[in-house]
């Protein structure tokens, strides 16, 4: 799988996930998020060449299509797959409040 | 919706879904399908700026990371989002088999 | 079940040629596009040249004119022919089968060691 285990201790050039951490104040503008100050997103990144971790039946077609067509627009690619939600602290007036924000931080990726 | 209604009749630059006929054997090099010898198949393809179709909490951080950091690798993909299976007939002998192939047509593309 | 089996790696010095095979179950080869892979110590696993059914090809720019995939229905079988053979390619072989029906699957070898070295 191409997830946190691999991808992190890896020096993969395909798709793969890759390390991130945001920053809320500095990176998105955000003020309203109390705790924590920011958190590792990650992301997805990398080419999807034939075979690499393709998510559908049309991922496959594409992708070899892809192989015999170099130089086509149509080509798979880089996306989240597993997400895990973030646990967050907001204010509603003085009052703190906890959630849960779902699908905040990639576990892994895929070709799509 | 980036569907085909939309994408089809719209010059739209950001993330659509785009027209592409595939033809099994002069694009895949396969002669296995008997019926039919190609199919539209379409693919996604644009930028996905901030707010444009974003399919999770996720892919709306990351375009408002991209916004703020536009020089960034990380930014959401234009992917398939609903896909349709494709009828096809081949052979196993002399025995012509009908097979639905789940998952083959992009409909709509989301931003991931 | 189905099975994917390579043969023919050896042990070659630098110049030298070898043929590889890669014997499939009947029930995939026939529309099964199939493939030869490769992977070095420390390297990731790369494309080295995919067949069709068809008999369409492709390959990687570092195997073009000197390595020819080839496939025998009759026989069930892939060969990778490998001609000039240099240091750098130097890994273990595998062989694969993307399938659409009757299952969409990717089935791999175990793969077969081929070292050049003088």
């Known amino acids: 799988a191409l997830d946190t285990n691999y991808c992190f201790s890896s020096t993969e050039k395909n798709c793969c996930v890759r390390q991130l951490y945001i920053d809320f104040r500095k990176d998105l503008g955000w003020k309203w998020i109390h705790e924590p100050k920011g958190y590792h997103a990650n992301f997805c990144l990398g080419p999807c060449p034939y075979i690499w971790s393709l998510d559908t039946q049309y991922s496959k077609v594409l992708a070899l299509y892809n192989q015999h067509n170099p130089g086509a627009s149509a080509a798979p690619c880089c996306v989240p797959q597993a997400l895990e939600p973030l646990p967050i602290v907001y204010y509603v007036g003085r009052k703190p409040k906890v959630e849960q924000l779902s699908n905040m931080i990639v576990r892994s990726c895929k070709c799509s | 919706a980036l569907d085909t209604n939309y994408c089809f009749s719209s010059t739209e630059k950001n993330c659509c879904v785009r027209q592409l006929y595939i033809d099994f054997r002069k694009d895949l090099g396969w002669k296995w399908i008997h019926e039919p010898k190609g199919y539209h198949a379409n693919f996604c393809l644009g930028p996905c700026p901030y707010i444009w179709s974003l399919d999770t909490q996720y892919s709306k951080v990351l375009a408002l990371y991209n916004q703020h950091n536009p020089g960034a690798s990380a930014a959401p993909c234009c992917v398939p989002q609903a896909l349709e299976p494709l009828p096809i007939v081949y052979y196993v002998g002399r025995k012509p088999k009908v097979e639905q192939l789940s998952n083959m047509i992009v409909r709509s593309c989301k931003c991931s | 079940e189905v099975q994917v089996v390579e043969s023919g790696g050896a042990a070659v010095q630098p110049g030298e040629s070898l043929r590889l095979s890669c014997a499939a179950s009947?029930?995939?080869?026939?529309?099964?596009?199939m493939g030869w892979f490769r992977q070095a110590p420390g390297k990731q696993r790369e494309m080295v040249a995919i067949?069709?059914?068809?008999?369409?090809?492709n390959y990687a720019d570092s195997v073009k004119g000197r390595f020819t995939i080839s496939r025998d229905a009759t026989k069930n079988t892939v060969y990778l022919q490998m001609n000039s053979l240099n240091p750098g390619d130097t890994a273990v072989y595998y062989c694969?089968?993307?399938?659409?029906?009757?299952?969409?699957?990717?089935?791999w070898g175990q793969g077969t060691q081929v070292t050049v070295s003088s």
């Open positions: 009947g029930s995939i080869f026939n529309t099964a596009t």
């Open positions: 067949i069709t059914d068809g008999g369409r090809t």
């Open positions: 694969n089968a993307l399938t659409i029906v009757p299952r969409s699957s990717i089935y």
